[in-house]
Structures are given as structure tokens and as C-alpha cells.
Interface confidence: medium
Amino acid sequence: DITPSVPPASYHPKPWLGAQPATVVTPGVNVTLRCRAPQPAWRFGLFKPGEIAPLLFRDVSSELAEFFLEEVTPAQGGIYRCCYRRPDWGPGVWSQPSDVLELLVTEELPRPSLVALPGPVVGPGANVSLRCAGRLRNMSFVLYREGVAAPLQYRHSAQPWADFTLLGARAPGTYSCYYHTPSAPYVLSQRSEVLVISWEGEGPEARPASSAPGMQAPGPPPSDPGAQAPSLSSFRPRGLVLQPLLPQTQDSWDPAPPPSDPGV
């Protein structure tokens, strides 16, 4: 069982490989990689590219094998595949490999970009779309506006970006966005740089995060009604876990997306 010899796909179809709780996790999380074969198997192997021997074996007479990665470190991130085999197959013969599973072990998701489409200057009666773009698919995206503690709009996207439509009359202002994992544990990306939307003739500007002291942090203000929510420039979310890449439809998020928004 050193180098897997892969027969034609018609012989031994590929298994499915998934991660729980997530494909993106913070260091120290326990991750289970589940390999499910389309038929009962005898041995399962977990492979990383460039390594001739399986990283882990599981000898189980069933269709499912679980590989436990305890308290993962960034070094354990990367691409994984699994294969299965049966005792009646020839020596070293494995099934077709599963599709790749990329495990990312990191503290936070990368910063998204925030751009205005068609541009950051709004003409009379025109709407503007803000595109918050990250690097990962199936994330939930949150748009914030300076001076407003609650998220302005919220949506899940199968793409690595989400578009938020602002009505022309209400568009001018300073905006920022995050994206985050779609289900628990919820962890944020770094915040985008702020984007200023202005009326035609006023002139837009893009400002670095530190120069937007009025922008308020995500989350409700503290319970003390007189207290201020911290500014986004001082908000440093930590931690990151991405749940399985499946969108979740939700009943009624608060704040609710506009009626035209397919939403989350």
C-alpha cells in the first residue's frame, strides 16, 4: 500500500470527502475528515498531494471512514483526497480519488475589497451597487455604513462576492464590508477599506480604515444606552471557522435585506 494504483473510473468510482465542523478552521480546532465510499470498503486512505503513501489509514468494513485531526495547526492545512480499497483488489490498487478538499487553518479570513459599480459618484436618481469581494465561495457578506451600528444589508452568496444595491437618494455615505462563515461558529474576515459614495460634483475618495473613526463596529451597541459602539477602526475580529459550503436560507434576518434582495 505505498503508491496508489488507480484503475479506470468504471471499476471503482470515487468516494466523497467532507470536513466537519468546517473546511476552514482556526488553529486548535478538532477536525474530522469523513470519506464515504459508494460501496462497502475494507480500507480507506487519506492522501495529500506529493506524498506517495497515505497520510492516514482506516480499516473499516463499511462505507464510511472518519479521519480525526486533533487540534489542527496551519501546517495541517492543504489539499486532501481520499481513496478506498477492498481485499479482493490487487495489491496497491485503490479507487479513483475523491474530489479535492482544501482545509485552511488560519486565524481570520482575508480582507475583502469593496468597490462601487459603475462608480463611487452617484448621479441624480441613479442607483449604485457596492460589490464586496472576498476569496472564498459560499460566504455571508455584511455591509456597514458609517454611523450605523447594525448591518445595513446582509446576504449569502455562492460566489466569492456579493452585490449590494443602494438607492440613489440614500447612497452617499461611507461604507465598509465584511464576509463571514455562513453558520456556527461565525467568524469574520478582516474589514474592507472604507468606500465613500458621493453625489455627482462632490468627488469621491477612498480612505484607509484608520481614518474612519465614525464607522461603528458590527454588533449591537453595549447594553448601556448611553455608551457608544466601538469604531470599526478599533474592531479586530479574531478567529475563523468555515462551515460546510452550503447556503442557508433564513426566514427574517434583522436588519432585513431590501425586498429586491434574494437575501439569505
Epitope: 466537519q20 455584511v142 456556527a184 461558529p185 461565525y186 454588533g219 442557508q248 436560507t249 426566514d251 434576518w253
Partner: antibody
């Protein structure tokens, strides 16, 4: 291991409000969701809504929209569920629950009995 | 909202027997978002199965879950005295909903 400890039983008059608390200990509070589920005597389970403390975003079941408010205080790792305009059919055990595995509820509070009676 | 129907409403069995509980959804549910809970009188529910087929931490292997789409099954291979309780299925891929429950009682 995360534990959820809820506030004590309440007796309320119809038309009033009740606020139940749920304190989390032993784990990361803000990056998880806290859901509220209720169970009327002899009945099944009914999901009311949830909050994601790190985002300050709430999600309510349509049935309770406008009558329930879920909040969280990250500094004390406590979530709150306030139900207003109480009626007798709101008499139930109210549970807070914490999803650690996908969004299934691994961890439950001990429950808070709320009785609505004139 | 997704409506879950459980059958039978009550299942009367003896210790050592096999219990098969059914949960049917009004529309397709991702198997990643289907869970089963056990509840005993006066106690909070206890998660048994998540993702349709994965056992939660500390759950004995006599409990197993299967199914996809709209039809899901919880099987208890050999009933132990402590297994007599009410069992709920739940979908949590959209606004979460629970089935009405199946009571497993001693024959």
C-alpha cells in the same frame, strides 16, 4: 465544554412581557449562535429565533416576528430572549441552545418555565 | 417553512428490539442539515444525530441515522431501557423546524 445556565421560572400576566437570560460559560460565546426554542406543556419543540453575538444579527421565526427580541451581552457572555404581549398559549418551557456542530443544537440550557396566567 | 412529519406517533416495543423512526419533509432538505434529538420527561432535548447520519459526541453506536432529500430515518438497533423517550427530527438548513415527535414506549 460549553454550558448554558438560564434564569429562573417566571409567572406573568397576559399582555405583559418576559425576559429570560442564558449565560454561557466554558467556551467562545460571541462566535456562535444562541437559539431560543420553546416547548408548551405536552407539546413539541418550536424554534423562535437566534442571535449571532459577534455580528449582532438576529434571525426570527415568522410566527414570532415583532413579538420576540433576542439580544446578547458579549461582556457577560449572556443572551436574552424577550417575548412581549404574552398570552396564555405562551405558557411553555423556554430553552436556549447553542450549535457547535453545523447548526444542530449540541448544548442546551436547563430550560425556564414561563407561566402566563391572569 | 419546511414542515416535518414523523411517523409513527407512538412506537411500542420491548427492550432489545429494533426501533425505526421516520421523518418526512415537505420539501427537500440538505442531509447536512437534518438532526435527531432524544427528550425524556423534565429534561432538555439531547442531540443524537446531525448531518442526517453522524452521531453526536458520546452517543452510542446503536443509534444511526440515514436518508436524504425528503425521507430520513433514525434506527435504534437494540433498545435499551434508557432509550424509551420522545424523539424529534429537526431541519436546520433554513429557518429551523422540528417534527412533532415519536414517542417510543415500553410494550
Amino acid at each position: 465544554q460549553v454550558q448554558l445556565v438560564q434564569s429562573g421560572a417566571e409567572v406573568k400576566k397576559p399582555g405583559s412581557s418576559v425576559k429570560v437570560s442564558c449565560k454561557a460559560s466554558g467556551g467562545t460565546f460571541s462566535s456562535y449562535a444562541i437559539s431560543w426554542v420553546r416547548q408548551a406543556p405536552g407539546q413539541g419543540l418550536e424554534w423562535m429565533g437566534k442571535i449571532i453575538p459577534i455580528l449582532g444579527i438576529t434571525n426570527y421565526a415568522q410566527k414570532f416576528q415583532g413579538r420576540v427580541t433576542i439580544t446578547a451581552d458579549k461582556s457577560t457572555s449572556t443572551a436574552y430572549m424577550e417575548l412581549s404581549s404574552l398570552r396564555s398559549e405562551d405558557t411553555a418551557v423556554y430553552y436556549c441552545a447553542n450549535p457547535l456542530t453545523f447548526d444542530a443544537f449540541d448544548i442546551w440550557g436547563q430550560g425556564t418555565m414561563v407561566t402566563v396566567s391572569s | 417553512e419546511i414542515v416535518l412529519t414523523q411517523s409513527p406517533g407512538t412506537l411500542s416495543l420491548s427492550p432489545g428490539e429494533r426501533a425505526t423512526l421516520s421523518c418526512r419533509a415537505s420539501q427537500s432538505v440538505s442531509s447536512s442539515y437534518l438532526a435527531w434529538y432524544q427528550q425524556k420527561p423534565g429534561q432538555a432535548p439531547r442531540l443524537l444525530i446531525y448531518g442526517a447520519s453522524s452521531r453526536a459526541t458520546g452517543i452510542p453506536d446503536r443509534f444511526s441515522g440515514s436518508g436524504s432529500g425528503t425521507d430520513f430515518t433514525l434506527t435504534i438497533s437494540r433498545l435499551e431501557p434508557e432509550d424509551f423517550a420522545v424523539y424529534y427530527c429537526q431541519q436546520y438548513g433554513s429557518s429551523p423546524t422540528f417534527g412533532p415527535g415519536t414517542k417510543v414506549d415500553i410494550k
